[in-house]
C-alpha cells in the first residue's frame, strides 16, 4: 500500500476516531520494549549502541495486519528483537531516509547506532525494497541478524 496516495483514505466514518493501543507495541510484540517517537529511538540507539528497527504500518492495511500477526507469533524474531531499539509508526516521519523508495506499508527499515539508515538491508521485492510479507519471516530474521552486525563498533 502506497501511503503517499491513499493513507487512511478508505476508512469508514465510524473508524475515524484514533484507536488507542494498549501499549506502544500496537500488537507487534507486547513483551518487547517499544519507543514512542523516532527522535527517542535514535537517541536510544546511539546511547545504547543497538541498531534501530523501524516498522511502518497502518491499522487499516490488510498486509500490515497480516505481517503483524506472524511477526508477533514468531518466537525467534521476537527473541532477536530484544537486541534492537524498536519503533513502529502509523504515520510518516519527516526523515526521508526512512522512505528510500517510497512511503508504502508495511515496510521495515534498519538504522545503525551511527545513525546511518541501512538501505542495503532489503527484502525480496524489487519494486518495494523494504516490504515484507508473511511468507518472508525467514528473510526478515536473517536481515535482523545482518543489522546486528554494526557498521562501526564504538568503543
Amino acid at each position: 500500500k502506497d501511503t503517499t496516495v491513499k493513507s487512511g483514505a478508505k476508512k469508514d466514518p465510524k473508524d475515524s476516531r484514533p484507536k488507542l493501543p494498549q501499549t506502544l507495541s500496537r500488537g507487534w510484540g507486547d513483551q518487547l520494549i517499544w519507543t514512542q517517537t523516532y527522535e527517542e529511538a535514535l537517541y536510544r540507539s546511539k546511547t545504547s549502541n543497538r541498531p534501530l528497527m523501524v516498522i511502518h504500518h497502518l491499522d487499516e492495511c490488510p498486509h500490515s495486519q497480516a505481517l503483524k500477526k506472524v511477526f508477533a507469533e514468531h518466537k525467534e524474531i521476537q527473541k532477536l528483537a530484544e537486541q534492537f531499539v524498536l519503533l513502529n509508526l502509523v504515520y510518516e516521519t519527516t526523515d526521508k531516509h526512512l522512505s528510500p523508495d517510497g512511503q508504502y506499508v508495511p515496510r521495515i527499515v534498519f538504522v545503525d547506532p551511527s545513525l546511518t539508515v541501512r538501505a542495503d538491508i532489503t527484502g525480496r521485492y524489487s519494486n518495494r525494497l523494504y516490504a515484507y510479507e508473511p511468507s518472508d519471516t525467514a528473510l526478515l530474521y536473517d536481515n535482523m541478524k545482518k543489522a546486528l552486525k554494526l557498521l562501526k563498533t564504538e568503543l
Partner: antibody, heavy 120, light 107 residues
Framework: QVQLVQSGSELKKPGASVKVSCKTS????????MNWVRQAPGQGLEWIGW????????NYNGKFKDRFVLSADKSVSTVYLQISSLKAEDTAVYFC?????????????WGQGTLVTVSS | EIVLTQSPATLSLSPGERATLSCKAS??????LSWFQQKPGQAPRTLIY???RLVDGIPARFSGSGSGQDFTLTISSLEPEDFAVYYC?????????FGGGTKVEIK
C-alpha cells in the same frame, strides 16, 4: 488435508437472526485469517470481512458493519458469521474462505457454502 | 473502494482453444490479485494468487500475469472442465473486492 465444513441451509423470517458456522481441520486454526464472502442468487461475490482466530481481530466491509458479526472459537476450531435483523436482500450463499497458509491475506481454501433464505 | 472490471463478460470458445481473460483495477494494487473458478452450485476454487503464483494442485495450463492495474488470466488450451465463471479479487486494501466475473462457455 485442509477442510472447511459449513453448517446447513437456513430458512429465516425477516427480522430474525442466523448464525452460520465453519468448522475447520487440517491446519493450525489460530494462524490463518478466515474470510466470509457472500453470493446472492445469480450474482457475483462480495467480501464481508475477515477474522484472525488467534486473537479475534476483525475487519469488516463497511457495507456489512452494522448487522454482521464474525467470531471464532479456538476450542472447536470453528468460525461463525452471525447476521441480525435479517432482510430479504440477505438471501444468499455464504462462504467461509481461509487465508494463505503462511498468514497471507489471499483466499486459499473455501467452504462448501451455506444458503440462507430470508422470506416471510 | 477499489473497482475491478473484468472483460469480456462472456467468452465463447471451443475445447483446445486459448482463453485470455482481463481484470482491470481502478487503482494500483501492486500484485495483490487472485483468480477463482466457479461452477454452478459449487464454491469458488482458487487458481492464482499474487497475480502469477499457481495454487498447488491447479493444472499448469492456467497462468496469471500483470501488476499495477492490468491483469490477465490465461488458459493455454481449454479442457471441457474449464468452462465456468472466473472471478478476480484484489486484496491490496480493505474492503477486498471482486470483479463481476467472466463466463467461459462452449462455442
Amino acid at each position: 488435508q485442509v477442510q472447511l465444513v459449513q453448517s446447513g441451509s437456513e430458512l429465516k423470517k425477516p427480522g430474525a437472526s442466523v448464525k452460520v458456522s465453519c468448522k475447520t481441520s487440517g491446519y493450525v486454526f489460530s494462524r490463518s485469517w478466515m474470510n466470509w464472502v457472500r453470493q446472492a442468487p445469480g450474482q457475483g461475490l462480495e467480501w464481508i470481512g475477515w477474522i484472525y482466530p488467534g486473537d479475534g481481530d476483525t475487519n469488516y466491509n463497511g457495507k456489512f458493519k452494522d448487522r454482521f458479526v464474525l467470531s471464532a472459537d479456538k476450542s472447536v476450531s470453528t468460525v461463525y458469521l452471525q447476521i441480525s435483523s435479517l432482510k430479504a436482500e440477505d438471501t444468499a450463499v455464504y462462504f467461509c474462505a481461509r487465508g494463505g497458509y503462511d498468514g497471507s491475506p489471499w483466499l486459499s481454501y473455501w467452504g462448501q457454502g451455506t444458503l440462507v433464505t430470508v422470506s416471510s | 473502494e477499489i473497482v475491478l472490471t473484468q472483460s469480456p463478460a462472456t467468452l465463447s470458445l471451443s475445447p483446445g482453444e486459448r482463453a485470455t481473460l482481463s481484470c482491470k483495477a481502478s487503482q494500483d494494487i501492486n500484485s495483490y490479485l487472485s483468480w477463482f473458478q466457479q461452477k454452478p452450485g459449487q464454491a469458488p476454487r482458487t487458481l492464482i494468487y499474487r497475480a502469477n503464483r499457481l495454487v498447488d494442485g491447479i493444472p499448469a495450463r492456467f497462468s496469471g500475469s500483470g501488476s499495477g492495474q492490468d491483469f490477465t488470466l490465461t488458459i493455454s488450451s481449454l479442457e471441457p472442465e474449464d468452462f465456468a465463471v472466473y472471478y478476480c479479487l484484489q486484496y491490496d486494501e480493505f474492503p477486498f473486492t471482486f470483479g463481476g466475473g467472466t463466463k467461459v462457455e462452449i462455442k
